[in-house]
Amino acid sequence: GQNITARIGEPLVLKCKGAPKKPPQQLEWKLNTGRTEAWKVLSPQGGSWDSVAHVLPNGSLLLPAVGIQDEGTFRCRTTNRNGKETKSNYRVRVYQIPGKPEILDPASELTAGIPSKVGTCVSDGGYPLGTLSWHMDGKLLVPDGKGVSVKEQTRRHPDTGLFTLQSELMVTPAGGGGPPPTFSCSFSPGLPRRRASYTAPIQPSVWEPGPLEVRLLVEPEGGAVAPGETVTLTCEAPAQPPPQIHWMKDGMSLPLPPSPVLLLPEVGPQDEGTYSCVATHPNRGPQESLPISISVETGEDGPTAGSEGGSGLGTLALA
């Protein structure tokens, strides 16, 4: 048999080999396609199938406008005047080339170290199903679930049966101050064998956030307190989303749930030590504050102030 690839909406003529050029002809066309459940023999007189397929005077079969449902097998059997039988067999596959792919909602800016949406690539009105691919600086991007992730969606038009493909690209750009990356998207058709078509490239800028600023504040100011007093330690780390705050004492992690505030009620000698907080941001990693010393006054000769990182300041900022 012969494989035929036909474009949806276009006419297709299948020749009945060996058929006399004009009537009278002894021939039979039958088809098994998406419109039939088994073999359908076409009436030579024509009829309600003519809008889909009908026999021309020369014995060929005309499909006036090929559709998805016309994919299948077409067979002609003809007997010439000498009684010799000739068979023709065609396997028809159909295709439709979609519009040029487009990147919708392209990002103008990405944030280094943070997963950012680059855009959504759309290919509309193709058949059969093709594939969308993303490229960065001309190289194929392979989703790894970490720095590069792709979310794909396929929809089929209820009336036409044509496909719409969507592919959303998320990347976590590296910092480093090099030139911003260039992204493009390509569509590769499932049929026929054709070169991929590409979108226009986009080049969002990459913003590099500075290091997380973690400040530790102590109340009462100074960090030197009388026994039985309450000390409040507050960790400030402005960022979105808010980071998780963990507490350290004398270099050891305190077994407490994450919280930006640490209360030390009714302090005693056991509470003395060096305190710091660690802010953990999902995209910037952990950052520790400068430490603060808490001292408990035990009498007139005892210490009168806490030392905070060797300075007498009540708050310390981490540059």
Partner: antibody, heavy 119, light 107 residues
């Protein structure tokens, strides 16, 4: 909204002629096959004629072949049925319907026009 | 030519009844059968297309099924507005053929 409106029915003598019209609106007329169906008084439905969307191909049952001619004017969104050599058994309500090929069947019908063949 | 034998030719039923009408094709017509409803003095209205598909705006109590060359129209719970005549149509082969009709009357 799809609308089909028949006209041209009436009383005609046996052997006479009549031309029915069907005005179509609410859809792209030249995308569809069109059909005439009739119904004799108190009887069932009978297919009379079909025409493809271009007007190049026409189809009839033996009962009306060579007497009736279906045609269309896509520029005017109109379907016609020329009936010649009319007989008493042609007396019926004639309906215009959209479709007639395997992609549609008949999906919309007009309200019909009565043709009476009598002396 | 294909014959479409429709049965019964008439039936009496009450509101709420389940009603079944059958058409048998004399040869294979694939899925190419429609069902129509017709009320006195009105044009037919398509209920089911391609054997099993409900036409737009038709209540879901109507359904169509097919087994080989046997086609069935079912009304799951008859309503007062369903008393009418029902026709099947094969449109796979010319001449296109209607069934003889089934008149559904009030019991």
């Amino acid at each position: 909204e799809v609308q089909l409106v028949e006209s041209g029915g009436g009383l005609v003598q046996p052997g006479g002629s009549l031309r029915l019209s069907c005005a179509a609106s609410g859809f792209t007329f030249n995308n569809y096959w069109m059909t005439w169906v009739r119904q004799a008084p108190g009887k069932g439905l009978e297919w009379v004629a079909s025409i493809d969307n271009s007007g190049d191909n026409t189809y009839y049952p033996d009962s009306v072949k060579d007497r009736f001619t279906i045609s269309r004017d896509n520029a005017k969104n109109s379907l016609y049925l020329q009936m010649n050599s009319l007989r008493a058994e042609d007396t019926a309500v004639y309906y215009c319907a959209r479709g007639g090929d395997i992609t549609t069947g008949f999906d919309y019908w007009g309200q019909g026009t009565l043709v009476t063949v009598s002396s | 030519d294909i014959q479409m034998t429709q049965s019964p030719s008439s039936l009496s039923a009450s509101v709420g009844d389940r009603v079944t009408i059958t058409c048998r094709a004399s040869q294979d017509v694939g899925i190419y059968v429609n069902w129509f409803q017709q009320k006195p003095g009105k044009a037919p209205r398509r209920l089911i297309y391609r054997a099993t598909n409900l036409a737009d705006g038709v209540p879901s109590r109507f359904s169509g099924s097919r087994s080989g060359t046997d086609f069935t129209l079912t009304i799951s719970s008859l309503q007062p507005e369903d008393f009418a005549t029902y026709y099947c149509l094969e449109f796979d082969e010319h001449p296109l053929t209607f069934g003889g009709g089934t008149k559904v009357e009030i019991k």
